[in-house]
């Protein structure tokens, strides 16, 4: 078909054509997190704004209860940024005393829950050691990649420590996905 | 329509079909920045290469005067990376003297300007404290997400300190957007 | 065509329509790296998993011998994350002695090889100084942008030090591309 003018009568396509404006899409933005119980050995999930400001969901992509719900099977680009901020970690004090130590860390995981596998699947992980000396610190972790998802799959963002997440601005911490 | 051969006579689509090669797209790359006056309390905007090397604009997406001009309404993926480099910050010297201090920082903001709205909107922000001891330092900040933009919107990249931007290579600092 | 119902008889399109599910796409995930000889002054390339777990290639996008092979010309979004981890760098010891020093660093480069051009082209680079005091450290570098690629182009990911790459989990270090 390369370079050929569109002619419906002889066009051969191997999959149904699709109007781009009709594809499931979402961009969610940070809100203040309410402390919730989470399972031991499992990072807590963030909850999100899905309507106000820059946030939106469209074309059957729904947000509910910390999850983005995938409404149709296909390849999706999934992304998130979490900005963390904190005070000097204990690790830095130990370091100042000259004793090496396993550093404190910050971690973001984009997780998929699916009905075809009993355990949540970690799609993306960004993890960083934090060993700051004598100061407040702040930094983002960004993640994004393409995944084959199934109708009914659920996506969430988990973090190592919810109290370190910067929830002050919608442009600092966000989560999104769109069907390619 | 799933699994069904393309048959124009009975295809039902909820939005007009669109050839992908016809969508507005741009990838801009860094150039040496000329010092310019910028408003107090407002981060300066970077200007960009839009034609040479890896840089391009296409399908009515235009670059002019530090701005990417959105030629049609829709959902766009917008991204940028800025690589910063600098000498030891003052903060580290203060820290060495044992006094905690609000750290120096580096910040990138992707900003949208809309004629119908008086204030620029910050779409994406990456901000990081920098407290390096006794050395030159360098590091990138990457941002990317999807936004619903309107025809006539203008996008720019602002940074906290233009003198810290690494303009030496087109692959280190860049800015792009494409209609989904 | 805006807002107009799909009517094949009068639709005007400037490029052939294309079913999204038919586009070349790949997401590759990290595997343990086998030490290989690489040219002096050239960063070594990573090799990847292309079938198991989250990894896939589809629609004529093939992976072979560390390269993603571009099967058709067009605009692609290309991305990678590499998570590095290491022990205290020498740099930190020098710093502790109070002598400023060019810091150790970690670098990721997404490189394009084109048969018709003798030199590889660096599409994206993420480079970061690492000067950690008295601890193990770990951190990701993420890259992603859009490029106009030609059929037959080959993409690879190069790193400054293959021994520092975290190959333990498919969600930490990955590489992908998809036709827009």
């Amino acid at each position: 078909l390369k370079g050929q003018e569109f002619a419906p009568s002889h066009q051969q396509v191997y999959a149904p054509l699709r109007a781009d404006g009709d594809k499931p899409r979402a961009h969610l933005t940070v809100v203040r997190q309410t402390p919730t119980q989470h399972l031991k050995n499992q990072f807590p999930a963030l909850h999100w704004e899905h309507e106000l400001g820059l946030a939106f969901t469209k074309n059957r992509m729904n947000y509910t209860n910390k999850f983005l719900l995938i409404p149709e099977s296909g390849d999706y680009f999934v992304y998130s940024q979490v900005t963390f901020r904190g005070m000097t970690s204990e690790c830095s004090e130990i370091r100042q005393a000259g004793r090496p130590n396993k550093p404190d860390s910050i971690t973001v995981v984009i997780t998929k829950v699916t009905d075809s596998y009993p355990e949540p699947t970690q799609l993306l992980m960004g993890t960083k050691s934090v060993c700051e000396v004598g100061s407040n610190w702040f930094q983002p972790i960004y993640l994004g990649a393409m995944f084959s998802l199934q109708e009914g799959d659920k996506l969430m963002v988990n973090v190592s420590d919810i109290s370190l997440v910067d929830y002050t601005k919608e442009d600092k911490t966000f989560f999104g996905a769109f069907l390619l | 329509l799933k699994g069904q051969e393309f048959a124009p006579s009975h295809q039902q689509v909820y939005a007009p079909l669109r050839a992908d090669g016809d969508k507005p797209r741009a990838h801009l790359t860094v150039v040496r920045q000329t010092p310019t006056q910028h408003l107090k309390n407002q981060f300066p905007a970077l200007h960009w290469e839009h034609e040479l090397g890896l840089a391009f604009t296409k399908n009515r997406m235009n670059y002019t005067n530090k701005f990417l001009l959105i030629p049609e309404s829709g959902d766009y993926f917008v991204y940028s990376q800025v690589t910063f480099r600098g000498m030891t910050s003052e903060c580290s010297e203060i820290r060495q003297a044992g006094r905690p201090n609000k750290p120096d920082s580096i910040t990138v903001v992707i900003t949208k300007v809309t004629d119908s709205y008086p204030e620029p909107t910050q779409l994406l922000m990456g901000t990081k404290s920098v407290c390096e001891v006794g050395s030159n330092w360098f590091q990138p900040i990457y941002l990317g997400a999807m936004f619903s933009l309107q025809e006539g919107d203008k996008l720019m990249v602002n940074v906290s300190d233009i003198s810290l931007v690494d303009y030496t290579k087109e692959d280190k600092t860049f800015f792009g957007a494409f209609l989904l | 065509l805006k807002g107009q119902e799909f009517a094949p008889s009068h639709q005007q399109v400037y490029a052939p329509l294309r079913a999204d599910g038919d586009k070349p796409r790949a997401h590759l995930t990290v595997v343990r790296q086998t030490p290989t000889q690489h040219l002096k002054n050239q960063f070594p390339a990573l090799h990847w998993e292309h079938e198991l777990g989250l990894a896939f290639t589809k629609n004529r996008m093939n992976y072979t011998n560390k390269f993603l092979l571009i099967p058709e010309s067009g605009d692609y979004f290309v991305y990678s994350q590499v998570t590095f981890r290491g022990m205290t760098s020498e740099c930190s010891e020098i710093r502790q002695a109070g002598r400023p020093n060019k810091p150790d660093s970690i670098t990721v480069v997404i490189t394009k090889v084109t048969d018709s051009y003798p030199e590889p082209t660096q599409l994206l680079m993420g480079t970061k100084s690492v000067c950690e005091v008295g601890s193990n450290w770990f951190q990701p570098i993420y890259l992603g942008a859009m490029f106009s690629l030609q059929e037959g182009d080959k993409l690879m990911v190069n790193v400054s030090d293959i021994s520092l790459v975290d190959y333990t989990k498919e969600d930490k270090t990955f590489f992908g591309a998809f036709l827009l």
Epitope: T64, T114, Y117, G152, K154 | - | -
Partner: antibody, heavy 116, light 106 residues
Framework: QVQLQESGPGLVRPSQTLSLTCTVS????????MHWVRQRPGRGLEWMGR????????KYNPSLKSRVTITRDTSKNQVSLRLSSVTAADTAVYYC?????????WGQGSLVTVSS | DIQMTQSPSSLSASVGDRVTITCRAS?????MYWYQQKPGKAPKLLIY???NLASGVPSRFSGSGSGTDFTFTISSLQPEDIATYYC?????????FGQGTKVEIK
Amino acid sequence: QVQLQESGPGLVRPSQTLSLTCTVSGFDMQSTYMHWVRQRPGRGLEWMGRIEPAGGHTKYNPSLKSRVTITRDTSKNQVSLRLSSVTAADTAVYYCVRSGGLPDVWGQGSLVTVSS
Amino acid sequence: DIQMTQSPSSLSASVGDRVTITCRASSSVSYMYWYQQKPGKAPKLLIYGASNLASGVPSRFSGSGSGTDFTFTISSLQPEDIATYYCQQWEGNPRTFGQGTKVEIK
């Protein structure tokens, strides 16, 4: 404590509709998936279908699709199964099952007999 | 449908014996699940993802395999292991179980 409790009539007349309810407690149903599996006397296990409670997406066993409906009421923490036009071959123990997080959890099962 | 063919349909072994059950899928699957069902009880997940042991399950149970051929093993049969064991695939629609293997003590 995570629990699933099936309830409904133990006897259904042929050609009628079998209706069962699964009431869950001890977890957030919306973050999981809820399935119905049945076991006919002396037979193996047969998956009937599932619902994703947050959005209501359903998948059914094609062999039962024309007769089976699974719904949910998240406010009541309940999932329901309806199987229409039953015959004696639908006599079975019906299990409600949670997936989407380890361990998967099964109800104790509800025996339904189809007989006139 | 993906058919699951489990063998043997029943077996009798002594306490301490190694017991192996196989399951063959009619087409390739990524993951296999193994359940234990005791009389009058609901099935209990033992193995997920072909080889992962579910929480609280004794280490004498194990699973292996990929593609179409999967194996479930009890390394040292215990009296409490008397049950029927089922394999299951979760990928194709419908989800399908093997017909079961009844394990008895000699």
